[in-house]
């Protein structure tokens, strides 16, 4: 027989087929110009040794052979023997280590038989009624045509599905979503109406991420709030990466969930913004407010579920840091300002109270007075920190107030409102004889004592009646009670105690009035 | 050693259907063309339909768009789905098993016993 032309004779090998799952596959055949045809296939498995032969039975009944030797591709005109206008079926047999393995067959008529593209260019993947909907332009000059998909999932092996019939410009495919794990899609075409035209090649991998982004599993620690009022917010544990098929390994357009930080700045409620969304690779500076996160995984079909975290309020006090002035007008506060043109946020709540009652109050942007001061002043009627006891108060600062990230902590500390030195005042002072010549007082706790750092100390004043002399003694505010010695028996003396702060002095209580007996030797 | 056992053949009144299953036993080849032939007393043996190991199918002109030729490879069984019969339908069904092609088509060396199928107006 010659290379050129179907061989109508048995194949110059025995017929012993393998059961090979390997071999060749995938053969497709069709008409390349007005008279040439070619048919081309993949084989799978080791291919030294191998020898091709394509088969060919016509309609007729007869059957021939092409040898093609090692190549997977082989082309013939329409005078090598095949009927081209009648339904031919086509084979390849491999005949390799004295074995024939077998292709599976194409029925088909080579002149109809043209040679389809798979879907070339963009595929557009969109979500449609819990099904995924894949859209791309119809190859040039191949309108009508068989649709087929496959996928599979990282675990799963390909399975093959059915996109029916196409007749437009534009082709699409209804296609199953995942709920949870990552697809791979690929399709193919071949020419509608064309009784067993070939398949084209797969098309290039579509990669479709699942329905529901991961949900993302961080974790986060928080770094000492520094000198300037700020804290890092750390990334401890990445997020888990979405485990993707075979082909969809390395790049992935289209699986890629990306994860947002939000940012819900739950102190000084009063400014205008009091939420960001960040990429979480960038971290972010916090002050030293409280805050709740939120990692938000998303893909191309939207957001998924959020994981949320709260960031306490740094409770680190510095008792110093603030003045605060009681004027027949009001209450000025007074700090060291931070920088030219800082808006201020303070922010004031009952100690011991919810944190939803936090009240507080935007300043205008300030630039630092002479002292290098900043200031924020109100008056009697406004109630603010009006009633008598104990407040937490935060000073908030930044240059740039609309920006959430740029907030930084100014001082964190106690205050106690309303007339401060009258309710401060310690009742129930009680005097007891201790020895001949000295008595213990003691008195209840100042009010102004539950209120951190408030109460500087407790003077105790002892006035004797006789000689009008007076003493004072300072006794730690943490300290209810003194020792006075010193006494002289039968004289009369008053006691009285008085709290005072860093920068008021208190109300003396009530005086007390008490004397040492006489001692009277038997 | 390769097994074809026929059934699901019958008596029915033209216009009816029957289905023909053959069940394929021993067979070592993937690649085989399975068929069915009918034989008609004092008339020669005639190709019905053939499916190929990839699905491919043949018919005779006398039965296209009436009978459906389809395979099940896991159970290596065959089917003939036999609708709108007609009294010239009636012969012996007997499935064919070809693991070879020759020059001159399947070669089909293994044969089941048949099963009538008798269609009366």
């Known amino acids: 027989c010659r290379t050129s032309e179907c061989c109508f004779q048995d194949p110059p090998y025995p017929d012993a087929d393998s059961g090979s799952a390997s071999g060749p596959r995938d053969l497709r055949c069709y008409r390349i110009s007005s008279d040439r045809y070619e048919c081309s296939w993949q084989y799978e498995g080791p291919t030294a040794g191998v020898s091709h032969f394509l088969r060919c039975c016509l309609s007729s009944g007869r059957c021939c052979y092409f040898a093609a030797g090692s190549a997977t591709r082989l082309q013939f005109s329409d005078q090598a023997g095949v009927s081209v206008l009648y339904t031919v079926t086509l084979w390849v047999e491999s005949w390799a280590r004295n074995q024939t393995e077998k292709s599976p067959e194409v029925t088909l008529q080579l002149y109809n038989s043209v040679k389809y593209e798979p879907p070339l260019g963009d595929i557009k993947v969109s979500k449609l009624a819990g099904q995924l909907r894949m859209e791309w332009e119809t190859p040039d000059n191949q309108v009508g045509a068989e649709v087929q998909f496959r996928h599979r999932t990282p675990s799963s092996p390909w399975k093959l599905g059915d996109c029916g019939p196409q007749d437009d410009d534009t082709e699409s495919c209804l296609c199953p979503l995942e709920m949870n794990v990552a697809q791979e899609f690929q399709l193919r075409r071949r020419q509608l109406g064309s009784q067993g035209s070939s398949w084209s090649k797969w098309s290039s991998p579509v990669c479709v991420p699942p329905e529901n982004p991961p949900q993302p599993q961080v974790r986060f620690s928080v770094e000492q709030l520094g000198q300037d009022g700020r804290r890092r917010l750390t990334l401890k544990e990445q997020p888990t990466q979405l485990e993707l098929p075979e082909g969809c390994q390395g790049l992935a357009p289209g699986t890629e969930v990306t994860y947002r930080l939000q940012l819900h700045m739950l102190s000084c409620p009063c400014k205008a913004k009091a939420t960001r969304t960040l990429h979480l690779g960038k971290m972010p500076y916090l002050s030293g407010a409280a805050y709740n996160v939120a990692v938000i995984s998303s893909n191309q079909f939207g957001p998924g579920l959020n994981q949320t975290w709260h960031i306490p309020a740094d409770t680190h006090t510095e008792p110093v840091a603030l003045n605060i002035s009681v004027g027949t007008n009001g209450t000025t506060m007074y700090w060291p300002a931070r920088a030219q043109s800082m808006t201020y946020c303070i922010e004031w709540q009952p100690v011991g109270q919810d944190g939803g009652l936090a009240t507080c109050s935007l300043t205008a942007p300030q630039d630092p007075d002479p002292a290098g001061m900043a200031t924020y002043s109100w008056s009697r009627e406004s109630g603010a920190m009006g009633q008598e006891k104990c407040y937490y108060i935060t000073i908030f600062a930044s240059a740039h107030p609309e920006k959430l990230t740029l907030w930084s902590t100014v001082l964190s500390t106690y205050h106690f409102g309303g007339n401060a030195s009258a309710a401060g005042t310690p009742h129930h002072v009680s005097v007891k004889n201790h020895s001949l010549d000295s008595v213990s007082v003691d008195w209840a706790p100042s009010l102004l004592s539950t209120c951190p750092g408030v109460l500087k100390e407790y003077v105790v004043r002892c006035r004797d009646e006789d000689s009008k002399q007076v003493s004072e003694h300072p006794v730690q505010p943490t300290e209810t009670q003194v020792t006075l010695s010193g006494l002289r028996a039968g004289v009369a003396y008053t006691v009285q105690v008085r709290a005072d702060t860093a920068w008021l002095r208190g109300v003396w209580s009530q005086p007390q009035r008490f004397s040492i007996e006489v001692q009277v030797s038997d | 050693q390769v097994q074809l056992v026929e059934s699901g053949g019958g008596a029915v009144q033209a216009g009816g259907s029957l289905r023909l299953s053959c069940a394929a036993s021993?067979?070592?080849?993937?690649?085989?063309?399975m068929a069915w032939f009918r034989q008609a007393p004092g008339i020669e043996r005639e190709f019905v339909a053939s499916i190929w190991w990839g699905g491919s199918t043949y018919y005779a002109d006398s039965v296209k768009d009436r009978f459906t030729i389809s395979r099940d490879n896991a159970e290596n069984t065959v089917y003939l789905q036999m609708n709108s019969l007609k009294p010239e339908d009636t012969a012996v069904y007997r499935c064919a098993v070809g693991t070879k092609i020759g020059t001159m088509g399947p070669r089909y060396d293994y044969w089941g016993q048949g099963t009538q199928v008798t269609v009366s107006s």
């Open positions: 021993g067979l070592t080849s993937r690649h085989y063309v």
